[in-house]
């Protein structure tokens, strides 16, 4: 920052609430799409340009005027892998977090015209090109269809689809949200011969029902009904199939070959949790028991003579956890070598740190190729010579991210490709590799302004800067911006990291109000090196509030000892650690311990509420947005991963003593703002309704706000502005700020 250390002499404006809500200062991205091993697409002034990665020269791939006469607002586009067609998406209608329906048209890039025959139907739920060529698979009305050519009729693959009952090629609510993080449940083989798909059956899954009020003119509210398995309830069942798309014909029904779950899964409830093609005729499936501490990977080969898929028991790989659950959120995906006979996978090592292990398909044991008291975040690319991964090893900072490569012929030869590129500005990287990993884009997201650069894998040479946010940097020179502190405290001989957004001209001899911004869910991380312009930026810059976050027990990327500490005990250590963090912050000398607040959303709303209901005396006030209040109200896959089942034989006792409602009496000691969207499909309004009822029943005065027809994100433009304005008023009143 330019100016002086003296706040009174600094005439620059602060970052205001309006700046946040109106997005006055915009971070520039550089979103590219690789189309080959040396070319990528980039949208500039609505023209789609194709860039040569090596030389940086570009040409117009598609002019912005091409679709002037189209008559629809194009939401997204997707180019076929062979570059012959472009799929245009319009009439986008959001469903849940990832799911939506849309209309699609296909433009022939050679003929320079829209294909008007055999069009994809409106309200299509998912569409995807094959990995090579230009086949299309799509899901409409819960059934799967394939187009061999864009202008040819679709071949119907399934006939069983039924709304809210049978889902072919798409996920139901819980699989979308908690397992695949996607609407799609379709997986093309690498050359597009086979299409694998999952089928979910929600026949017995109970429905969540809530009112949707819609337009003022609607006399009777609509009732939304969603199959949603709450903890302990009946779950969806899953089947898995593969169809050979070369066999499809209009005059005979497609033959889908089922691959059944391993016997060790079929003994009880289970999930399909990963699908990865290893080769053209080899597929790996990972299955997970409902009690999520045991998973099995099956490796299945196509038998050409029978047209069936065979999964040899000798090739099964079991992954289990004795201290918690498998994977960070689910078992990690395998990265197969070219021949499909071996793969690399992130698993927990004996010390409980997640590292890369090398598996051969016919051998049970694997060889760890990385080790240390840090974790591998993700495998990003695999070539014949190197494996590229992101980890938080550098400088022992769990909240950092850097790109590494490891030589496959000698695992001791590890190079950090990003660590020293710009060490002050850039400590948190993600990466996007070209098709065969010849080039890569590094995306640095902090602690300085985001920086996008292009590199060659041949010599790891930086080729060029794609976006450096210099225009934003110039603008922010004229703003009194907060600073960010990332550090750790030691509790019980363990490092726990925190971050603080500190007001401009921070003076450690002064006393500041502090807002604890909490999430604290399993495998979460709130203390990191990412640059953000958010509500906290406003609170620190304009209101001189310190906004802190703390990663206590249960948080991720620091080993299972920390992460699995809350296994079967949600609402305990992660809650206590937020309170302890606030106490520690109070002792640092610059915090006004009479003005400490806490806020969080979703799991953070639960922790906020549990903290405020703890009777600790540390917090004056807090805000819970869309909180969980009782784990039996939340979905089965997420909840049971950490809590087991709400049965007397399993963990019912802790389900019952980890509710917000049981702490109602203690809310008399704090100021509480409770907020929820009425159309929250994820954390149901029911959860806040029950908090409210419990507080009313014991005579607690509290503030509340509902957002009509808003879901878990409360993200519509008006609601977003309203909620942050409302919360700002609440915090300012709590802290006695003008």
């Amino acid at each position: 920052n330019k100016g002086t250390d003296d706040a009174t002499a600094d005439s620059r404006k602060t970052y205001t609430l309006t700046d946040y809500l109106k997005n006055t200062y915009r971070l520039k991205l550089y979103s590219l799409r690789w189309i080959s091993d040396h070319e990528y697409l980039y949208k500039q002034e609505n023209n789609i340009l194709v860039f040569n990665a090596e030389y940086g020269n570009s040409s117009v791939f598609l002019e912005n005027s091409t679709f002037d006469e189209f008559g629809h607002s194009i939401n997204d586009y997707s180019i076929s892998p062979d570059g012959q067609f472009i799929l245009l998406e319009y009439n986008y209608v959001k469903q849940w977090r990832h799911s939506y329906t849309a209309s699609y048209d296909i433009y022939d890039l050679n003929k320079r015209q829209l294909i008007t025959e055999e069009r994809i139907p409106n309200n299509t739920q998912w569409v995807t090109w094959s990995p090579v060529g230009h086949k299309l698979a799509y899901v409409w009305n819960n059934d799967i269809y394939v187009k061999i050519e864009p202008n040819l009729p679709s071949y119907r693959i399934t006939w069983t689809g039924k709304e809210d009952i049978i889902y072919n090629g798409i996920t139901d609510w819980v699989y979308e949200e908690e397992v695949f993080s996607a609407y799609s449940a379709l997986w093309w083989s690498p050359n597009g011969t086979f299409l694998a798909y999952a089928q979910f059956n929600d026949t017995e899954v109970p429905l969540i029902e809530y009112s949707f009020y819609s337009d003022e003119s609607l006399q009777y509210p609509k009732t939304v009904r969603v199959p949603y398995p709450k903890a302990g309830a009946v779950n969806p069942t899953v089947k898995f199939f593969v169809v050979n798309t070369d066999s499809l014909s209009s005059v005979t029904n497609a033959t889908s070959i089922q691959i059944t779950a391993p016997a060790s899964m079929l003994i009880g409830d289970h999930y399909l949790c990963d699908v990865t093609w290893a080769t053209q005729e080899r597929i790996s499936l990972q299955w997970l028991r409902r009690i999520q501490n045991y998973s099995v990977m099956d490796i299945c080969d196509y038998d050409e003579s029978s047209g069936r898929w065979n999964c040899l028991v000798a090739r099964q790989h079991i992954e289990m956890s004795t201290t918690g659950w498998v994977g960070r959120f689910r078992p990690s995906e395998p990265h197969f070598t070219l021949d499909g006979n071996s793969f690399y996978k992130i698993i927990s090592n004996e010390e409980g740190y997640r590292h890369i292990c090398y598996f051969q398909i016919d051998k049970k044991d694997c060889t760890f190729i990385t080790k240390g008291t840090w974790e591998v975040i993700g495998i990003e690319a695999l070539t014949s010579d190197y494996l590229y991964y992101i980890s938080n090893e550098y400088k022992g900072m769990p909240g950092g991210r850097n790109l590494y490569k490891i030589q496959l012929s000698d695992y001791t030869k590890v190079t950090c490709l990003s660590c020293e590129l710009n060490p002050e500005r850039c400590q948190y990287y993600s990466v996007s590799f070209s098709k065969e990993a010849k080039y890569y884009q590094l995306r640095c997201s902090g602690p300085g302004l985001p920086l996008y650069t292009l590199h060659s894998s041949v010599n790891d040479k930086g080729l060029r800067v794609l976006e450096d946010n210099s225009a934003l940097d110039k603008m922010l020179q004229n703003v009194q911006m907060p600073s960010k502190k990332l550090d750790f405290i030691i509790l019980n001989e363990t490092k726990f990291w925190y971050q603080m957004i500190l007001p401009p001209h921070f003076d450690k001899s002064k006393k500041y109000p502090l807002l604890l911004d909490v999430y604290a869910g399993p495998c979460s991380q709130k203390a990191d090196t990412v640059f953000r312009l958010n509500w906290a930026t406003y609170l620190a810059s304009t209101e001189n509030i310190i906004v802190a976050s703390f990663d206590g027990r249960g948080s991720g990327y620091q080993g299972d000892k920390i992460m699995h500490a809350i296994n079967r005990r949600l609402g305990t250590f992660e809650v206590e650690d937020q309170i302890e963090a606030a106490r520690q912050f109070s002792k640092m000398g610059f915090v006004d311990n009479k003005r400490i607040a806490i806020w969080g959303w979703s799991y953070g709303g639960y922790v906020t509420s549990m903290v405020l209901g703890s009777g600790s005396g540390v917090f004056k006030c807090g805000i819970a947005v869309a909180p969980v209040s009782r784990w039996e109200y939340y979905d089965s896959v997420y909840t049971e991963r950490y809590m087991g089942l709400p049965t007397p034989e399993d963990n019912l006792d802790h389900y019952r003593n980890s509710t917000v409602m049981s702490r109602a009496e203690n809310f008399k000691q704090v100021e509480y703002l409770l907020i929820h969207g009425t159309a929250d499909d994820n954390v149901h309004f029911q959860q806040s309704a029950q908090i409210s009822k419990a507080l009313v029943d014991v005579g607690v005065d509290f503030q509340a706000m509902w957002y009509t027809d808003e879901d878990h994100g409360i993200a519509s433009s008006t609601a977003h502005q309203h909620i942050y304005t409302h919360m700002s008023h609440f915090i300012k009143q709590c802290f006695s700020l003008p």
Epitope: E117, E118, I148, E149, N151, L152, P153, Y155, N244, D246, S247, L248, S249, S250, V251, T252, T255, E304, S305, S306, G307
Partner: antibody, heavy 116, light 107 residues
Framework: EVQLVQSGGGLKQPGETLRLSCTAS????????VHWVRQAPGKGLEWMGV???????DYDSSFMSRVTISKDTSKSTAYLQLNSLRAEDTAVYYC??????????WGQGTTVTVSS | DIQMTQSPSSLSASLGDRVTITCSAS??????LNWYQQKPDGAVKLLIY???NLHSGVPSRFSGSGSGTDFSLTISNLEPEDIATYYC?????????FGSGTKLEIK
């Protein structure tokens, strides 16, 4: 390279049973259907039936009672059996590969003459 | 069954000519129509699938069009190797049926 090589045929007596073979190479019979089409002397092409990749069969109703199409995937061979031969079954018989909704590769054809 | 009617049954044209063969279906078959070429030695080849799509390896002088009930095959620049009999075939419904053929000769 995809190829269909036909064998069998020749001179048959009325009432006899015809069994023709069609050996495929370059692809699997579990993936693509094999159709049988015949052509009587001086006439056009006539579809007889199909065995699909999964082994299901469909026949033209005019041959339904007399025809059987089968395959041995281990030998990559499809078969046409036509019972109770009569003079009007004299024709060139073709096997052809089903790709989606068209016949993309054809056998060379085999001549069958039914005569006493 | 769907009847396929092809015309003419035979035609004579000169090298370099543009030749059109038509085919009509007894009921609507959308675009589910294929064209085949049978050489004098009996060898059969796919030319066009789904009304207008050229099979790989087929010269671009061949083109197909039409939908519903009326279809045509056009050879834009007749060459000597095009001497053959041409058949249309519907593939929308079993049993598959062929046209009666058009024999093309060189004048």
């Amino acid at each position: 390279e995809v190829q269909l090589v036909q064998s069998g045929g020749g001179l048959k007596q009325p009432g006899e049973t015809l069994r023709l073979s069609c050996t495929a190479s370059g692809y699997s019979l579990t993936t693509y259907g094999v159709h049988w089409v015949r052509q009587a002397p001086g006439k056009g092409l006539e579809w007889m039936g199909v065995i699909w990749g999964d082994g299901r069969t469909d026949y033209d109703s005019s041959f339904m009672s007399r025809v059987t199409i089968s395959k041995d995937t281990s030998k990559s061979t499809a078969y046409l059996q036509l019972n109770s031969l009569r003079a009007e079954d004299t024709a060139v018989y073709y096997c052809t590969r089903n790709r989606h909704d068209w016949f993309d590769y054809w056998g060379q054809g085999t001549t069958v003459t039914v005569s006493s | 069954d769907i009847q396929m009617t092809q015309s003419p049954s035979s035609l004579s044209a000169s090298l370099g000519d543009r030749v059109t063969i038509t085919c009509s279906a007894s009921q609507g078959i959308r675009n589910s129509l294929n064209w085949y070429q049978q050489k004098p030695d009996g060898a059969v080849k796919l030319l066009i699938y789904y009304s207008s799509n050229l099979h790989s390896g087929v010269p671009s002088r061949f083109s197909g069009s039409g939908s519903g009930t009326d279809f045509s095959l056009t050879i834009s620049n007749l060459e000597p190797e095009d001497i053959a009999t041409y058949y249309c075939q519907q593939s929308i419904k079993l049993p598959f049926t062929f046209g009666s053929g058009t024999k093309l000769e060189i004048k």
